[in-house]
Interface confidence: low
Amino acid sequence: EVEKTACPSGKKAREIDESLIFYKKWELEACVDAALLATQMDRVNAIPFTYEQLDVLKHKLDELYPQGYPESVIQHLGYLFLKMSPEDIRKWNVTSLETLKALLEVNKGHEMSPQVATLIDRFVKGRGQLDKDTLDTLTAFYPGYLCSLSPEELSSVPPSSIWAVRPQDLDTCDPRQLDVLYPKARLAFQNMNGSEYFVKIQSFLGGAPTEDLKALSQQNVSMDLATFMKLRTDAVLPLTVAEVQKLLGPHVEGLKAEERHRPVRDWILRQRQDDLDTLGLGLQG
């Protein structure tokens, strides 16, 4: 906290401009009116304030708006957003997509911070729903955000958003989430040819039903074992030995190393020994 001191004569700020970068912290505290700051927040980012000076400006806004900043101020926070704590952000009511975009832009290129996670939570609560525009914005900044949504929230994700998703963004998705995302991915990629389609759909196959796995087995896709191990057990069980052999192609030999793990273990137990023997891997049903 900055000690309360009177503003020196002639130093009272009439507007937020570059002259303020020469003010000491106590001078900013004493000479900048919080209401003036609030109405001219859009100028702050154009001025090379130090982090210490920004702390003072934040303190002034906190005093002016103890119940939380209005959206007119929030939209123009810019780099001052990086000074906010999740506790600060929980007081906000953010409803404008422009405000959300402006603040996500500040954090662009960085991982999702607790501040950003709280901001998004406040925004979604303020809007009352996850509409297409919101989801397009969030997936553009954080494709991995999909996996932090509940299956119910994911149901409103437009298939067009799926194109932004990279394989690593789905690493943390639960089976229930993939159950919702897979049909959307299938729809999004439906006009691609066989090999390109498989490359795109591969990450989502943890939500694929048996009939789609059977169809893939007819397309020489050569699924790797890592992908196979993430498939739904109930989707794998009805597959025949011949279908699994076609699905995995040259990777079928990897079944031996995974024979004690689901879904391979459960699948083996469902097969006739004669059929397993045709693989020549020594699998015991």
């Epitope: 607790p114 709280t118 939570d121 996996c147 932090s148 509940s150 929230e153 639960d174």
Partner: nanobody, 125 residues
Framework: QVQLVESGGGVVQPGGSLRLSCAAS????????VAWFRQAPGKGLEGVAA????????VYTDSVKGRFTISRDNSKNTLYLQMNSLRAEDTAVYYC??????????????????WGQGTTVTVSS
């Protein structure tokens, strides 16, 4: 009341190992997904590893795969993180978390209701 207490942090040289523990009390530990998160200096919170109550299908963030192992002992109400081949970029405050919100990803930072106070791991030569 629910309490999560982490321990096992410290200073270790690159390539070294540490084992973090998280002791839980005040909840039926065996029925909860539990996870490790970390926050490096000046960085955001990051999910490291998570283990569901079934103790199957553990999840790891890419940067620790093959080096870190998450495990749990339900009889002791304790979560562990075995960290091998430590690197400077593993330096962080490590937190355990539990009471996962239904439907959220196991490594989502907004996915847990209960958090520990953290234990500091410093990897430095």
């Amino acid at each position: 009341q629910v309490q999560l207490v982490e321990s096992g942090g410290g200073v270790v040289q690159p390539g070294g190992s540490l084992r973090l523990s998280c002791a839980a009390s005040g909840l039926s530990f065996s029925t909860y997904t539990v996870a490790w998160f970390r926050q490096a200096p000046g960085k955001g919170l990051e999910g490291v590893a998570a283990i569901p109550y079934t103790s199957q299908h553990m999840v790891y963030t890419d940067s620790v795969k093959g080096r870190f192992t998450i495990s749990r002992d339900n009889s002791k109400n304790t979560l562990y993180l075995q960290m091998n081949s430590l690197r400077a970029e593993d330096t962080a405050v490590y937190y355990c978390a539990t009471d996962r919100r239904p439907g959220t990803s196991m490594l989502a930072i907004n996915g847990y209701n209960r958090w520990g106070q953290g234990t500091t791991v410093t990897v430095s030569s």
